[in-house]
C-alpha cells in the first residue's frame, strides 16, 4: 500500500519560518502534489502549493518556496508573520496523486517538544498515514 510521509520543522534562525517536507512511498509516478494547512480537526484549511511534474509549481502566501526534492518528494518553506504565521497546532497536509492509481494524503504538525530557540532534529521521524 502506498504511503505518504510528512516532516514539519521550525527554523532556528527565523522563528516564523517553517519547512515542510513530504514524500511518497509507492511504485507509481507522481502526477500532482498538493500541500495544504489549517487548524486542528480540519478547521479553516487552505492550499499552500500545488506541484505538477510537467505544468510547474503554484504557491500562495505564506508559502515562499515550493520545490521538488526528488521525483517523489517535495519541500516547502513557509514565511509567516502576524495572522499568516503558523502556530504550534497548525496542521500541514500533503496529498500525492498518482494517476490513474489514486491519491494518498498524510498530515503532520510541529512536534510538541519543539523549542522555538532550537532547531528540530535533522531527521525527525516521519508521520505516516495510509488511508
Amino acid at each position: 500500500t502506498p504511503e505518504v510521509w510528512v516532516q514539519v520543522r521550525m527554523e532556528a534562525t527565523e522563528l516564523s519560518s517553517f519547512t515542510i517536507r513530504c514524500g511518497f512511498l509507492g511504485s507509481g509516478s507522481i502526477s500532482l502534489v498538493t500541500v495544504s494547512w489549517g487548524g486542528p480537526n480540519g478547521a479553516g484549511g487552505t492550499t499552500l502549493a500545488v506541484l505538477h511534474p510537467e505544468r510547474g509549481i503554484r504557491q500562495w502566501a505564506p508559502a515562499r518556496q515550493a520545490r521538488w526534492e526528488t521525483q517523489s518528494s517535495i519541500s516547502l518553506i513557509l514565511e509567516g508573520s502576524g495572522a499568516s504565521s503558523p502556530c504550534a497546532n497548525t496542521t500541514f497536509c500533503c496529498k500525492f496523486a498518482s494517476f490513474p492509481e489514486g491519491s494518498w494524503e498524510a498530515c503532520g504538525s510541529l512536534p510538541p517538544s519543539s523549542d522555538p530557540g532550537l532547531s528540530a532534529p535533522p531527521t525527525p521521524a516521519p508521520i505516516l498515514r495510509a488511508d
Epitope: 500532482l32 480540519g42 484549511g45 503554484r58 490513474p100 491519491s103
Partner: nanobody, 127 residues
Framework: EVQLVESGGGLVQPGGSLRLSCAAS????????MSWVRQAPGKGLEWVST????????SYVDSVKGRFTISRDNTKNTLYLQMNSLRAEDTAVYYC????????????????????WGQGTMVTVSS
C-alpha cells in the same frame, strides 16, 4: 486512500433539474478546493465549476452560469452540483475532482491534472 464517489446522475428531460453529490473520504476535505468537470461523448474534458475550501468563493464556466450552483458541506465531506434548466448540451459524464484547474490553465485538461478524482456519473438530457 482518497475516495471521491459521485452520485445523482441520470436521464432528465430538457429544462429539468438534477443534483449531483460527491462523497469524499480518506483526506482532509475541508482543506482543499473542489471542482466539477465533465466530458461529453466524443469530447475532451471541460471545467464546469470550482468552490474554494471554505465555500467563500465559487466560479463557473460561462455556459452554466445562472443554471448550475456548486456547494459543499465540510461537516459531511460532501460536494454538490445543483443543475437546473438542463440542456441537451449538458449531456456528459460529470467528475468530482480535488483542485482548481485554473492553477495551470484550462487547455488540454485531463483528470491527471487534479489531486483526486472520482469515477464519474452520467447525466443525459434528452426528451
Amino acid at each position: 486512500e482518497v475516495q471521491l464517489v459521485e452520485s445523482g446522475g441520470g436521464l432528465v428531460q430538457p429544462g429539468g433539474s438534477l443534483r449531483l453529490s460527491c462523497a469524499a473520504s480518506g483526506f482532509t476535505f475541508s482543506y482543499y478546493d473542489m471542482s466539477w468537470v465533465r466530458q461529453a461523448p466524443g469530447k475532451g474534458l471541460e471545467w464546469v465549476s470550482t468552490i474554494n475550501s471554505n465555500a467563500g468563493r465559487t466560479s463557473y464556466v460561462d455556459s452554466v452560469k445562472g443554471r448550475f450552483t456548486i456547494s459543499r458541506d465540510n461537516t459531511k465531506n460532501t460536494l454538490y452540483l445543483q443543475m437546473n434548466s438542463l440542456r441537451a448540451e449538458d449531456t456528459a459524464v460529470y467528475y468530482c475532482v480535488e483542485g482548481d484547474p485554473h492553477n495551470f490553465g484550462l487547455e488540454s485538461l485531463s483528470l491527471r491534472d487534479f489531486g483526486s478524482w472520482g469515477q464519474g456519473t452520467m447525466v443525459t438530457v434528452s426528451s
